[in-house]
Interface confidence: medium
């Protein structure tokens, strides 16, 4: 059945080489004395990408990251030695790994690093305007980085700088045991989560922090932290990880008598990302890896995209789940998790909840308390012992929108772009993996907006070596994606419409919301350009409907490529044909010489079909003819290639090979007659040449044959050799051999 495509595979798979050759990736391959390009800060206004790395901070031009400035910020020799004496790795740990890089004000950034297990922070001057071209470290103003950056570069940190205050989730000690959510800087006393209480935080791995408004009153603003942590005893049998969302009020200043300088509004809830399984057992994706907030229209209600992986070492899988803030708020307004002792199960708290409800921000909106310091003692006591909610937050549609379980990689990062297409708005996800690839995925509504279909558009390799993607930023202004890893930074466009093909159908089949057929090419779609010729169908990707009135040859596509190739009787030959689209199914037809009828090729011992093409073994004269390679996708058939195979009989080849350079055939005839079959080694030599990886040898061989042939024709004008026309074709065809300068413009090789 040719109708069924392969939806779980990327339509286009581009290697790093193909990305480079088609000018679709720009890479900064790092400095010799740096690494770990993990901390990104995008500044669209200045058109800069600031990147924190090992001992360096970079300022890349968003237009082209090859254009950059750098600040060197290493640690002193003394610090490095102390770190080494503490038993740490001199290269991987005893350096200044930048973990925090935030906009502090109009003129400065705030940066913190591990400082060789001695966290340190400072300010970076960037000037008032982009044209100031300032990028320098404030050497006179270093600050203690405790509670801002971890000591250990392996530990994750989530931070957010708003109104001169830094919120950070990190480890505050050398041993990496005292994890907390802190608020530092600013004019107020520092605040933190409760210490030494696993109910608050239990060995967390912080992912990100975001400010989200609750109402039009800024007093209600909350900071949300996304993290994963060990499940608390009794919450789960055995050791398990749970993904979490935590909230704190921006105007929380701690308690008066209890929870002094500690958060009084901290609450956390579990994020569920699972697939319902047989026997009611769900497959859980619990290891939260990254979060992206899609702010659209209403900043109070962003859509939360989370990237998750499985905890199991046996079953490796990744998923993307979407959450709505209304669901998150509903959970935080629901029952608190409660248990009476360490051996009891967690249950929803049934008793009286004190007023104002713990977790509510002190404001005019929800009650008459001006400050958390005024909160009644029973509220503080309750908040301290009930930091977790009983109900989890379920994803929209109760299931992931993207799942990958049958691959050798796992998801690590995500950014999302909302794109206006002809038939609506689509969220295009760019998902980074632990092998240095980026997946471009579009979620397409089926019957309802909630019921989404994932379409994997592209899989792009963006780094030369497989390396985990650890940071990603998307510039809507530049329409570019920026990717960070241990090895370096990469930049690629959000869309490459031209690579989908040169036909309306190919453009339509791509289902890329960025692209549409403009009448002559697949190009960037702009909703403002009101042109009736724009063809696009993201929802269905149906070229038969959208491209049927465009009368081109060959099923509304361009003419197929035509090739002539030569095979030797009893040898094997390979007809290469693989469509650009990995989703297309290929089938072959054969048309005998001088016949109209085409028959579908059946696979047997004589013909073997592979993903790359067709292998014909032990060639016979009857195999001569036309071979047509067709791609079928979404009901649309396209002829990619027409190969004319000429099978050369052994006798003619022998004659060709044994002609003398002077054109006198008598010597050859004589030799041929006197040779025993075992002495006829020419055929073996010929096959050796065909199979030789060094094509130049083949070129030289053919060159000799043509030279002889030309000489023969010059010396005997009246003589027309039986098959010389075939060799003429071969000679002409030689120039057209595909040397695969563009890997994705695949075509058969001709000998």
């Amino acid at each position: 059945n040719y109708q069924n495509g392969k939806n779980n595979v990327p339509r286009l798979k581009l290697s790093y080489k193909e990305m480079l050759e088609s000018n679709n990736v720009i890479t900064f391959n790092g400095l010799a004395n740096s690494s770990s390009y993990h901390t990104f800060l995008l500044d669209e206004e200045r058109s800069r990408l600031y990147v924190g790395a090992k001992d360096h901070i970079f300022s890349f031009d968003l237009v082209n990251i090859k254009d950059f400035q750098k600040i060197v910020w290493p640690v002193s020799y003394t610090r490095r030695d102390e770190c080494k004496w503490a038993g740490k790795d001199i290269l991987k740990e005893c350096a200044n790994f930048i973990k925090v890089l935030k906009a502090y004000n109009q003129t400065h950034l705030y940066a913190c690093g591990t400082g060789a297990f001695h966290p340190i922070c400072t300010y970076i001057e960037i000037g008032h305007h982009p044209e100031d071209n300032i990028f320098k470290l404030e050497n006179s103003h270093f600050e203690n980085g405790r509670g801002k950056s971890p000591y250990d570069p392996k530990l994750l940190t989530a931070s957010l700088l708003i109104d001169g205050e830094l919120y950070s989730g990190t480890a505050a000690d050398f041993m990496g045991r005292d994890f907390a959510i802190f608020r530092t800087l600013g004019h107020h006393h520092p605040i933190r989560t409760e210490q030494h209480d696993s109910r608050w935080l239990n060995d967390p791995k912080f992912i990100s922090a975001h400010l989200i408004s609750e109402s039009d009153n800024p007093e209600d603003d909350k900071v949300y932290f996304f993290f994963r942590e060990n499940a608390i005893d009794g919450e789960h049998s055995g050791k398990a990880t749970h993904a979490r969302i935590g909230q704190i009020c921006k105007n929380d200043f701690g308690g008066h008598r209890s929870l002094v300088n500690k958060w009084t509004t901290f609450l956390k809830a579990r994020l569920i990302c699972s697939v319902p399984g047989p026997n009611g057992i769900d497959t859980h994706f619990d290891e939260l890896q990254d979060v992206f907030l899609m702010n659209f229209k209403d900043p109070k209600n962003p859509v939360v995209y989370g990237v998750f992986t499985t905890s199991s070492n046996i079953f490796k899988g990744s998923a993307v789940c979407m959450y709505s803030m209304s669901d998150v708020r509903r959970v935080f307004l629901g029952p608190y998790a409660h248990r009476d002792g360490p051996n009891y199960q967690w249950v929803p708290y049934q008793g009286r909840v004190p007023y104002p409800r713990p977790g509510t921000c002190p404001s005019k909106t929800f009650g008459g308390f001006d400050s958390t310091k005024d909160l009644p003692d029973d509220v503080i006591t309750f908040a301290r012992s009930h930091p977790a909610m009983y109900n989890p937050v379920f994803p929209m549609n109760n299931r992931p929108i993207v799942i990958k379980t049958d691959v050798n990689y796992q998801f690590t990062q995500i950014v999302v772009d909302r794109v206006d297409a002809e038939d609506g708005q689509y969220d295009v996800m760019f998902i980074g993996t632990d092998v240095g690839t980026v997946l471009k995925v579009v979620s397409i509504p089926k019957e309802t907006w909630y019921d989404l279909e994932e379409v994997l558009l592209e899989e792009m390799t963006v780094f030369r070596e497989p390396t985990a993607i650890s940071a990603m930023e998307l510039s809507t202004k530049q329409q570019q994606l920026y990717i960070g890893s241990t090895a370096g930074v990469a930049q690629l466009p959000l869309h490459r419409c031209d690579i989908y093909g040169k036909a309306c159908a190919e453009c339509c089949l791509a289902r890329d919301p960025y692209c549409a057929w403009d009448g002559s090419a697949c190009s960037r779609y702009f909703p403002t350009a009101k042109r009736r010729t724009r063809r696009q169908d993201i929802r269905n990707g149906d070229p038969l409907t959208h491209c049927s009135d465009l009368h081109h040859d060959n099923h509304h596509g361009h003419s197929p490529e035509e090739r002539i190739i030569y095979g030797v009787e009893n040898s094997s030959t390979f007809l290469e044909c693989s469509p650009k689209s990995q989703r297309a199914l290929v089938y072959w037809q054969f048309q005998r010489r001088n016949e109209e009828r085409k028959e579908e090729i059946r696979v047997d011992d004589h013909i073997i079909r592979t993903d790359q093409g067709l292998l014909l073994r032990s060639l016979q004269q009857k195999d001569s003819g036309n071979y047509l390679c067709h791609a079928v996708e979404h009901g649309f058939i396209q002829t990619l290639l027409k190969v004319t195979l000429e099978v050369i009989d052994t006798e003619h080849l022998e004659e060709l090979l044994h002609k003398d350079d002077d054109g006198d055939g008598s010597k050859t005839k004589e030799m041929s007659n006197s040779m025993t079959p075992s002495q006829k080694v020419w055929y073996r030599d010929f096959m050796q040449l065909i199979n030789h990886p060094n094509l130049n040898t083949m070129d030289e061989f053919c060159e000799q044959v043509w030279k002889r042939d030309r000489k023969q024709r010059r010396q005997r004008p009246g003589h027309t050799p039986g098959n010389s026309n075939k060799w003429k074709h071969l000679q002409e065809n030689k120039k057209g051999r595909n040397r695969r300068t563009h890997e994705f413009e695949r075509a058969p090789r001709s000998v």
């Epitope: 001695h118 203690n144 002094v260 300088n261």
Partner: antibody, heavy 123, light 111 residues
């Protein structure tokens, strides 16, 4: 007014045991980290042990590890120090001190101290 | 032998200014840990005098001030008075798994 009152000190033979208590009042005892600090006659101050508000974190000076046990009863607003295998060098005035977190929550100061109780280890 | 080093004694006449130093290392004061100062009047319990290197708790006269630089800290007392005669202790934390450490103490004599 914050008050810390130590008791339980006295004369004990080497190898013997004592249990010190510290009764707290004037503040929310269950919210604070508490410590024991000692001072040998004519000598300086030495931190002995600390305990977090919920007993989730407990730490000891190397010199007393394995011999002393710190504990608390929040319902009674009382801090304890169980001292076993006492040695002559444990002779000191033992102070109960509250962790203040006045400047930061990393490195608390001791913002309130009791008057101390004398422990003498001698045969 | 204390981890933090203080001069055993200092003295000054009433009205004078005296400073007491507290020298640590890169694993305590130099590691960014806070420094606190305590005053112990004869026969009494210690009392918090300065916290976080330079902050005074309420009730402590502004004649007392503290500072910190690198691996050391200092306490300054201006306008010396007879009632300032006492033992002064600095404290910090010793890493990497921090625990409280005290200086050996400095006896201040008002001449």
């Amino acid at each position: 007014e914050v008050q810390l009152l130590e008791s339980g000190g006295g004369l004990v033979q080497p190898g013997g045991s004592l249990r010190l208590s510290c009764a707290a009042s004037g503040f929310d005892f269950s919210s604070y980290e508490m410590n024991w600090v000692r001072q040998a006659p004519g000598k300086g101050l030495e931190w002995v042990s600390g305990i977090s508000w919920n007993s989730g974190w407990i730490d000891y000076a190397d010199s007393v590890k394995g011999r002393f046990t710190i504990s608390r009863d929040n319902s009674k607003n009382t801090l304890y120090l169980q001292m076993n295998s006492l040695r002559a060098e444990d002779t000191a005035v033992y102070y109960c001190a509250r962790s203040g977190y006045s400047s930061s929550w990393f490195d608390p100061d001791f913002d309130y101290w009791g008057q101390g109780t004398l422990v003498t280890v001698s045969s | 032998q204390s981890v933090l080093t203080q001069p055993p004694s200092v003295s000054g006449a009433p009205g004078q200014r005296v400073t007491i130093s507290c020298t640590g290392s890169s694993s305590n004061i130099g590691a960014g840990y806070d420094v606190h100062w305590y005053q112990q009047l004869p026969g009494t319990a210690p009392k918090l005098l300065i916290y976080g290197a330079s902050n005074r708790p309420s009730g402590v006269p502004d004649r007392f001030s503290g500072s910190k630089s690198g691996t050391s800290a200092s306490l300054a007392i201006t306008g010396l008075q007879a009632e300032d005669e006492a033992d002064y202790y600095c404290s910090s934390y010793e890493g990497p798994n921090p625990y409280v450490v005290f200086g050996g103490g400095t006896k201040l004599t008002v001449l």
